[in-house]
Amino acid sequence: LMGGQDKPFLSARPSTVVPRGGHVALQCHYRRGFNNFMLYKEDRSHVPIFHGRIFQESFIMGPVTPAHAGTYRCRGSRPHSLTGWSAPSNPLVIMVTGNHRKPSLLAHPGPLLKSGETVILQCWSDVMFEHFFLHREGISEDPSRLVGQIHDGVSKANFSIGPLMPVLAGTYRCYGSVPHSPYQLSAPSDPLDIVITGLYEKPSLSAQPGPTVQAGENVTLSCSSWSSYDIYHLSREGEAHERRLRAVPKVNRTFQADFPLGPATHGGTYRCFGSFRALPCVWSNSSDPLLVSVTGNPSSSWPSPTEPSSKSGICRHLH
């Protein structure tokens, strides 16, 4: 990982993918330590700041511009050698985002998947991107790259992720790049949370006052388990969004969340899942489905939830 005998290892924190105007720390690790180092950019553009300068432990680059995008190498200090410097490090590609309109990102068959399944993340745009990049939040490695396929005025790429395991759950974004500027990426797509289910024991789901209610009667769905889940997620069949609530410890040593659905107007099939704060995108097995039936005059839709849900944000902590 740290390069050869006389070769330093250049890395970027927090990521090699940097938003325009952002900052990134470049570290040159040499001979079991972070020594003094020199930095080079392969195309030699836009780096007067490097010329003849020696950096200590890390180099903080920014606010970055499109001209910062490119391939970097470092040389570590080697006082007793002929040149005083090591061999060049591994190449490190810095990609700068925010240079073109954002693409769209979709999950097939969907963003909620069982452990072991495979998901296709499709990135597409009406901008004729030559390459698409897929990046998972919090990962410092280079993003996956695919050549864009152009068809009917749309460029797209299908990224296959799987078999799914906890480490692959998280928030994904994709970017596009145009020919001749391969490391100047578009603005990020809207974030897409990939959730893996089936890792822990299922919670139980019940309805108060019961699963069959009169139209207009207030309904609360309770999700509970003996497992010390931090968060419960409630989904309704046919709806893209889930609702989530913090679990509350009860006197009977269970952990429970009560989802108030408000006055009943329309039935539906509900499921709930539990998750832990440390792995917000890794969920339990689904509870048994609960069919809520409404007698009387069912209208076409259930009232909007008391707190709005969003396409993303599942993988962020509940504060």
Epitope: R13, P14, A25, H46, Q56, E57, I60, M61, G62
Partner: antibody, heavy 118, light 107 residues
Framework: QIQLVQSGSELKKPGASVKVSCKAS????????MQWVQKSPGQGLEWIGW????????KYAEDFKGRFAFSLDTSVSTAYLQISSLKAEDTAVYFC???????????WGQGTTVTVSS | DIVMTQSHKFLSASVGDRVTFTCKAS??????VAWYQQKPGQSPKLLIY???TRHTGVPDRFSGSGSGTDYTLTISSVQAEDVAVYYC?????????FGGGTKLEIK
């Protein structure tokens, strides 16, 4: 949004010490550095130096070596400037500003007035 | 140390005028020049860096140009809220140094 909030004004006697704090929010503290700039009465802006928030390594301008010291508490995203053996000529407004090795200071604190008077 | 000279201490303009601030470096700074705006009672704000890159949220009436030792900041159509002191700064080599500032006044 990115914000740098500095501690309040200080009135000190010559020979005393002062510690100015600069609390950052809205970005990952350790991916940037903190620059410090002095604005003396009737004077322009003068760069004191900066500290790399990733490595903790400070760098000082020649005129500010010795009595000026930078430190960090990354657990609370805060940078500090300490000035010891204060002199009347240290009377100034001190600014912290986010920036790295490239010397561009993209967000600034509101400034802390330090007055040194007997 | 690199000396940055802003020859005009004051500039006066009417609303809607085009105004240009100049800055001269004592040596070639290879386009590593930033411009800051300091309004009365406020801290400086970054406008431009690397000679011509506008900082996030800066109106496009502000633009920068230059190379070698000579750099300019232009406001294409001055607004009343642009009353401030404008500083140039070289970010080519440490110590980073600032010009003495030019105060923009509205007629």
């Amino acid at each position: 949004q990115i914000q740098l909030v500095q501690s309040g004004s200080e009135l000190k006697k010559p020979g005393a010490s002062v510690k100015v704090s600069c609390k950052a929010s809205g970005y990952t503290f350790t991916t940037a550095g903190m620059q410090w700039v002095q604005k003396s009465p009737g004077q322009g802006l003068e760069w004191i130096g900066w500290i790399n928030s990733h490595s903790g390594v400070p760098k000082y301008a020649e005129d500010f070596k010795g009595r000026f010291a930078f430190s960090l508490d990354t657990s609370v995203s805060t940078a500090y400037l300490q000035i010891s053996s204060l002199k009347a000529e240290d009377t100034a407004v001190y600014f912290c500003a986010r920036g790295g090795d490239e010397g561009v200071m993209d967000y600034w604190g509101q400034g802390t007035t330090v007055t040194v008077s007997s | 140390d690199i000396v940055m000279t802003q020859s005009h201490k004051f500039l006066s303009a009417s609303v809607g005028d085009r105004v240009t601030f100049t800055c001269k470096a004592s040596q070639d700074v290879s386009t590593a020049v930033a411009w800051y705006q300091q309004k009365p009672g406020q801290s400086p704000k970054l406008l431009i860096y690397w000679t011509s890159t506008r900082h996030t949220g800066v109106p496009d009436r502000f633009s920068g140009s230059g190379s070698g030792t000579d750099y300019t900041l232009t406001i294409s159509s001055v607004q009343a809220e642009d009353v401030a002191v404008y500083y140039c700064q070289q970010h080519y080599s440490t110590p980073w140094t600032f010009g003495g500032g030019t105060k923009l006044e509205i007629k």
